[in-house]
């Protein structure tokens, strides 16, 4: 008789999850020789240990501490790029601007990017059928707690000028409920971070509005200012041209506003 299994509202664990995490770890250490000291089998064991045999609505940041310790990584604290609802462009940017880093350019972010995972209380099985949805089921699920943990640590590490890429096509350009709005903004350290510079990415080619005047951006400015961090904002009217100019800054068309 098949054992009754909890049905959650969210998609189940990504297929080949263990193999993918292990393979990504090996790839990352090949690509980033400075992380060669990392034992990928130990990383997988720590990752697994954070959620296997635990109720998927009762995960804590503490569960991820062994993984956090193994994945400790120093990135230049003044080269951090945060993003909200515009991941692909942020990653295209750091692919070109090699000295800047998103969370997904770090080992732990790279390991988990776009993956879903959860286990079941008191069994060593991974649940490939369903996992808790943040809204419909519970917020303390393995995926949400992981991203909250790594995002907090990433924001805490930032210094000097921190950049954030925001999606100007969204109704809420700055969303207080996003990971950026609920975690990263509140964990920037005022004694280390001088300025948060927002880059608002325009979607429409004919969109010449100053989205830095958007009410949600003003709300972000207010939150940041109250934390004794300066705020600045730039419109990126042409994201395609923006990337092209990052690639070829000497191009004559790159002196005009992008």
């Amino acid at each position: 008789v098949p054992r009754w299994r909890q049905q959650w509202s969210g998609p189940g664990t990504t297929k080949r999850f263990p193999e993918t995490v292990l393979a990504r770890c090996v790839k990352y250490t090949e690509i980033h020789p400075e992380m060669r000291h990392v034992d990928c089998q130990s990383v997988w064991d720590a990752f697994k240990g954070a959620f296997i045999s635990k109720h998927p609505c009762n995960i804590t940041e503490e569960d991820y501490q062994p993984l956090m310790k193994l994945g400790t990584q120093t990135v230049p604290c003044n080269k951090i790029l945060l993003w909200s609802r515009i991941k692909d462009l942020a990653h295209q940017f750091t692919q070109v601007q090699r000295d800047m880093f998103t969370l997904e350019d770090t080992l732990l972010g790279y390991l988990a990017d776009d993956l879903t995972w959860c286990g079941e209380f008191n069994t060593s099985k991974i649940n490939y059928q369903s996992c808790p949805d943040w809204r419909k089921d519970c917020s303390n699920n393995p995926v949400s707690v992981f991203w909250k943990t790594v995002s907090r640590r990433f924001a805490e590490a930032a210094c000097d000028v921190v950049h954030v890429m925001l999606n100007g096509s969204r109704s809420k350009i700055f969303d207080k409920n996003s990971t950026f709005g609920s975690v990263e903004v509140h964990n920037l350290q005022p004694e280390k971070v001088q300025t948060l510079e927002a880059w608002v990415i325009h979607g429409g080619r004919e969109d010449s509005r100053d989205l830095c005047q958007d009410p949600t951006i003003k709300e972000l400015e207010s939150i940041i200012s109250k934390r004794n961090i300066q705020f600045s904002c730039k419109n990126i009217y042409r994201p395609d041209k923006f990337l092209q100019c990052v690639k070829n800054p000497e191009d004559s068309s790159c002196t005009s506003e992008i």
Epitope: R16, E19, T20, A23, R24, V26, K27, T29, E30, I31, P33, R36, H91, Q95
Partner: antibody
Framework: EVQLVQSGAEVKKPGATVKISCKVS????????MNWVQQHPGKGLEWMGW????????DVAEKFQGRVTITADTSTDTAYMELSSLRSEDTAVYYC?????????????WGQGTTVTVSS | DIQMTQSPSSLSASVGDRVTITCQAS??????VDWYQQKPGKAPKLLIY???QRYTGVPSRFSGSGSGTDFTFTISSLQPEDIATYYC?????????FGGGTKVEIK
């Protein structure tokens, strides 16, 4: 069994572009970085660059930047290396290569090589 | 870039001889050195990784040693099928770099 099978020999004129393919089998394509290595006739080996097929991220050696484009098609499990503005010095054998799980960061897996001849 | 200086560039030895090839890195590469064998018209074949680890299926007559900047590759008893060019490579730092090669011939 891991296999890397490259496209056939090419003869090109100076200034042209060549695109070499490397079709893999025997493993999950996105699980490994794919590297490209150049070897001039009777000479040594030179690393050209890599691609992470899962994300399309690439890194190209400084010497080849601006002329080499590395891409991957995950639907066909194939990596590509394109070399543009060909000159006679690009006459060489080009290999795709990847690491393995029990080989440190050495390359136990290689394609058979693709000979590119640049001649007017 | 890290330079890998390999010597000698060629050598001739008799079957059964002990053959030694050295490789010097221009800076510390820890133990991240690999050794390859290449026969004419073929792709290189990994023999040794991490300076001294023999890759799966590689005969025990092939060995490697060293760390830091100085590395040695040894064929304890040369066999006719060992006629090839041997390359060292460092995989410690991007870009990966190879030695110039050592062509081994039978006397």
């Amino acid at each position: 069994e891991v296999q890397l099978v490259q496209s056939g020999a090419e003869v090109k004129k100076p200034g042209a572009t060549v695109k070499i393919s490397c079709k893999v089998s025997g493993y999950t394509f996105t699980d490994s970085v794919m590297n490209w290595v150049q070897q001039h006739p009777g000479k040594g080996l030179e690393w050209m660059g890599w691609i992470d097929p899962e994300y399309g991220r690439t890194d190209v050696a400084e010497k080849f930047q601006g002329r080499v484009t590395i891409t991957a098609d995950t639907s066909t499990d194939t990596a590509y290396m394109e070399l543009s503005s060909l000159r006679s010095e690009d006459t060489a054998v080009y290999y795709c290569a990847r690491t393995g799980y029990n080989s440190g960061y050495g390359f136990p897996y290689w394609g058979q090589g693709t000979t590119v001849t640049v001649s007017s | 870039d890290i330079q890998m200086t390999q010597s000698p560039s060629s050598l001739s030895a008799s079957v059964g001889d002990r053959v030694t090839i050295t490789c010097q890195a221009s800076q510390n590469v820890d133990s991240d050195v690999d050794w390859y064998q290449q026969k004419p018209g073929k792709a290189p074949k990994l023999l040794i990784y991490k300076a001294s680890q023999r890759y799966t299926g590689v005969p025990s007559r092939f060995s490697g040693s060293g760390s830091g900047t100085d590395f040695t590759f040894t064929i304890s008893s040369l066999q006719p099928e060992d006629i090839a060019t041997y390359y060292c490579a460092q995989s410690n730092t991007h870009p990966r770099t190879f030695g110039g090669g050592t062509k081994v011939e039978i006397k």
